[in-house]
């Protein structure tokens, strides 16, 4: 089944054609494409009304459409793999001919949540109801169909063809017939606007006589944005009718001579154009020659005009259109400048915030300020950044180097710090002894206690291994600590001598202990320095590395 009957409506700079025929969306798009168009867009209420008009025209010609609820493809589609997006007016759909998403939509019902299948949109027409401008066709979403299987209730499609401009319809001053042939291969005798490059064939006469004259015209661009047939005077004029037939084909006034001849004229404030038929305002601004937000300003004596642009815009080379001024060329900002339509805005680098003297100035963010420090312990503010540091007994950790992790001194690289038992605590450690031994005053060695339970096989033999003082330890600390007062686990003992005598049992202890209140408050030099943001967004390469690498998402890992 091909595309059969068609209707056409031309308005503004576009023509819409409606076709009946049970085609898939791809076949319908192909049909529009072959003639230089696309399936129609419906980007505004006004455009929806144009499309509705062309559909109404088609339905008047089509005697009996098969379904009460008929659907006509338009150019709104969602490709395979693109998900429904409820946050957007077009829900993740886009117009096949490209172009920007617009806020107008007219969905029939909540859309099916899918990503895998390609989905296409049709206009849903209830043929039992009259088509009213107030009741515009709803958008219905569904599968796009396939050759021979267009989808349920698909009765046709609507194409859209865009043009540089339009010519006015030719005016006949006497009996005759005009046939327009458009660039998209449609023929029509009644168009309210005729697209650029259309041909007009005019056959003058009553139709039943031999004296029929034929004229052929082409809609051309006479000057920029001025489209004209190149004809002069009314067509098919007849002394028999004078001004009585179709106002002599004149746009405004028709003046008859005594011999049956006549001339066209214009009302005050208007002038007759070269075609000797059409009238145009003497005010050159009345034809809205300025584009893109430009305002038309009349010259002296109303003879000519200039276009003026709003602030932040300037005239382009045509002197008719406004283009954005790139204010960032003048470097008005201290750090980053972002050009916006009609203006600009200043932004600050990561680690800075707007402020300081002058427009567009930036000042350092004090990341270490009270209540906003990202560091677990120590924080030092730097220009555009900061770096974290940890207390004695902790090292910097975490992917962004803001956390502090306890150093397990009992398994440190220098070997055990205690002669016998070693208890790691949060931020510190302390030593202990086996049953029957007591801790020496140096807090590291063990000496024989008052009650002997049998000496360990390898008694302590070195005086002082402690590189830092452990926290206060009760004398004769045993190797089997139970739980702390709040039920928190105490430290895990680590023995530095593996061979213990059989009569000196060691019971297992729970894991880790919260840092004792008496932990030393000494600052340790940071192992990661947060590079300043001024040199570009950076982040540490690893937990204990001081190498900064470019972050692939362009954000600063520390901010």
């Amino acid at each position: 089944t091909g595309a059969d009957t068609e209707a056409v409506v031309c308005v503004g700079t576009a023509c819409y054609t409606a076709h009946s025929g049970k085609l898939s969306a791809a076949e319908a798009q192909n049909h529009c494409n072959q003639n230089g168009g696309n399936l129609a867009t419906v980007k505004s209420k006004e455009e929806a009304q144009h499309v509705q008009r062309v559909l109404a025209q088609l339905l008047r010609r089509e005697a009996a459409l098969t379904a009460r609820m008929s659907k006509f493809w338009i150019g709104l589609q969602r490709e395979k793999g693109k998900c429904l997006d409820p946050s957007l007016p077009l829900k993740g759909f886009s117009w096949v001919g490209g172009g920007e998403d617009t806020p107008y939509s007219n969905w029939h019902k909540e859309l099916r949540n899918s990503c895998i299948s390609k989905r296409c949109v049709s206009l849903l027409l209830d043929l039992s109801q009259p088509l009213l401008p107030s009741r515009l066709p709803k958008w219905s979403e569904g599968p796009c169909g396939s050759p021979g299987s267009p989808g349920s209730n698909i009765e046709g499609f609507v194409c859209k063809f865009s043009f540089k401009g339009m010519c006015r319809p030719l005016a006949l001053g006497g009996p005759g017939q005009v046939t327009y042939t458009t660039p998209f291969q449609t023929t029509s005798s009644s168009l309210e606007a005729v697209p650029f490059a259309s041909a007009a064939n005019v056959a003058c006469g009553e139709g039943d006589k031999d004296e029929t004259q034929s004229h052929y015209f082409l809609c051309k661009e006479k000057a920029p944005d001025v489209f004209d047939w190149g004809s002069s005077g009314p067509l098919c004029v007849s002394p028999k009718y004078g001004c009585n037939f179709n106002n002599g084909g004149c746009h405004q006034d028709c003046f008859e001579g005594g011999d049956g001849s006549f001339l066209c004229g214009c009302r005050p404030g208007f002038r007759l154009l070269d075609d000797l038929v059409t009238c145009a305002s003497r005010n050159p601004c009345s034809s809205s020659p300025c584009r893109g937000g430009a305002t038309c300003v009349l010259g002296p004596h109303g003879k000519n005009y200039t276009c003026r642009c709003p602030q932040g815009y300037q005239l382009d080379s045509s002197q008719l259109d406004c283009v954005d001024v790139d204010e960032c060329q003048d470097s008005p900002c201290a750090q980053e400048c972002v050009n916006t339509p009609g203006g600009f805005r200043c932004e600050c680098w990561v680690g800075y915030e707007p402020g300081g003297p002058g427009e567009g100035a930036c000042q350092d963010v004090d990341e270490c300020a009270l209540g906003r420090s990202p560091c677990a312990q120590g924080c030092t503010n730097t220009d555009g950044s900061f770096h974290c540091s940890c207390e004695e007994g902790y090292v910097l950790a975490g992917e962004d180097g803001t956390q502090c992790q306890d150093v397990d001194e009992c398994v440190g690289p220098g070997g055990p710090l205690c002669d016998s038992l070693c208890f790691n605590t949060q931020g510190s450690f302390h030593c202990g002894c086996l049953p029957g031994w007591v801790l020496a005053p140096n807090g590291v060695s063990c000496t024989m206690g008052p009650v002997s339970l049998g000496p360990p096989s390898g008694p302590p033999d070195e005086e002082d291994k402690g590189e830092k003082e452990g926290s206060t330890v009760p004398r004769a600390a045993t190797a089997s600590p139970t739980r702390g007062p709040e039920g928190t686990p105490k430290a895990t003992p680590t023995t530095s001598r593996p061979s213990l005598s059989s009569d000196a049992p060691i019971t297992s202890a729970p894991l880790k202990m919260l840092a004792p209140s008496g932990s030393p408050g000494v600052w340790r030099e940071p192992s990661i320095h947060h590079a300043t943001a001024a040199s570009g967004p950076q982040e540490p390469a690893g937990g204990d590395s001081s190498v900064a690498t470019q972050n692939n998402d362009g954000t600063d890992g520390q901010k």
Partner: antibody
Framework: QVQLQQSGADLVRPGASVKLSCKAS????????MHWVKQTPVYGLEWIGG????????AYNQNFKGKATLTADKSSSAAYMELRSLTSEDSAVYYC?????????????WGQGTSVTVSS | ENVLTQSPAIMSASPGEKVTMTCRAS???????LHWYQQKSGASPKLWIY???NLAFGVPARFSGSGSGTSYSLTISSVEAEDAATYYC?????????FGSGTKLEIK
């Protein structure tokens, strides 16, 4: 409420095929896509592919093309995944899942999983 | 394909602690298409956070999610024993959908 009921555990020989089923209830079957996910201790969760029951359209992870075939039966509201030429690498738990109430591929419904063991 | 890297692979925390796990993508992901799942041993995964920061039905308010571009994170403000599980991130930026390797959270 939405439920996805998967077939029971399977022990299959190397080189054989197996067809797993996922029966949906509590919603209109053709309204939601159905996806399949493989889980192993080594590779964790891997998306195999999905099917749109309304149209029969499918999308596959290239790593599983030729290994898995997804189908759906509207009349019984069930989705199927056939795995062929099985090897020990295919031993895994397979889940059917869909995103009924949410958008952007946030899988809010999961079956209980089917354990497939490939062993001679 | 867009590879998701989760870190750390395993983490342990005491009840009441604040924990953060991260998910990095090899290429940018729209925040709408980044989700987190919780899976407990022997159970199916459960959607936990969707579209970066929205909590799924029934998820406690102590959980939160944030991020954009290639870097995302899940945070638990005050860990509870019931939070012990493996957490997976998942993204979609074109087929195939991919999951992270998971972060196993153990409670001390």
């Amino acid at each position: 409420q939405v439920q996805l009921q998967q077939s029971g555990a399977d022990l299959v020989r190397p080189g054989a095929s197996v067809k797993l089923s996922c029966k949906a209830s509590g919603y209109t079957f053709t309204d939601y896509e159905m996806h399949w996910v493989k889980q192993t201790p080594v590779y964790g969760l891997e998306w195999i592919g999905g099917i749109d029951p309304e149209t029969g359209d499918t999308a596959y992870n290239q790593n599983f093309k030729g290994k898995a075939t997804l189908t759906a039966d509207k009349s019984s509201s069930a989705a199927y995944m056939e795995l062929r030429s099985l090897t020990s690498e295919d031993s895994a738990v397979y889940y059917c899942t869909n995103y009924g109430n949410l958008y952007y591929y946030a899988m809010d419904y999961w079956g209980q999983g089917t354990s497939v063991t490939v062993s001679s | 394909e867009n590879v998701l890297t989760q870190s750390p692979a395993i983490m342990s925390a005491s009840p009441g602690e604040k924990v953060t796990m991260t998910c990095r993508a090899s290429s940018s992901v729209s925040s709408s298409y980044l989700h987190w799942y919780q899976q407990k041993s022997g159970a199916s995964p459960k959607l936990w956070i969707y579209s970066t920061s929205n909590l799924a039905f029934g998820v406690p308010a102590r959980f939160s999610g944030s991020g954009s571009g290639t870097s995302y994170s899940l945070t638990i403000s005050s860990v509870e024993a019931e939070d012990a599980a493996t957490y997976y991130c998942q993204q979609y930026s074109g087929y195939p959908l991919t999951f992270g390797s998971g972060t196993k959270l153990e409670i001390k």
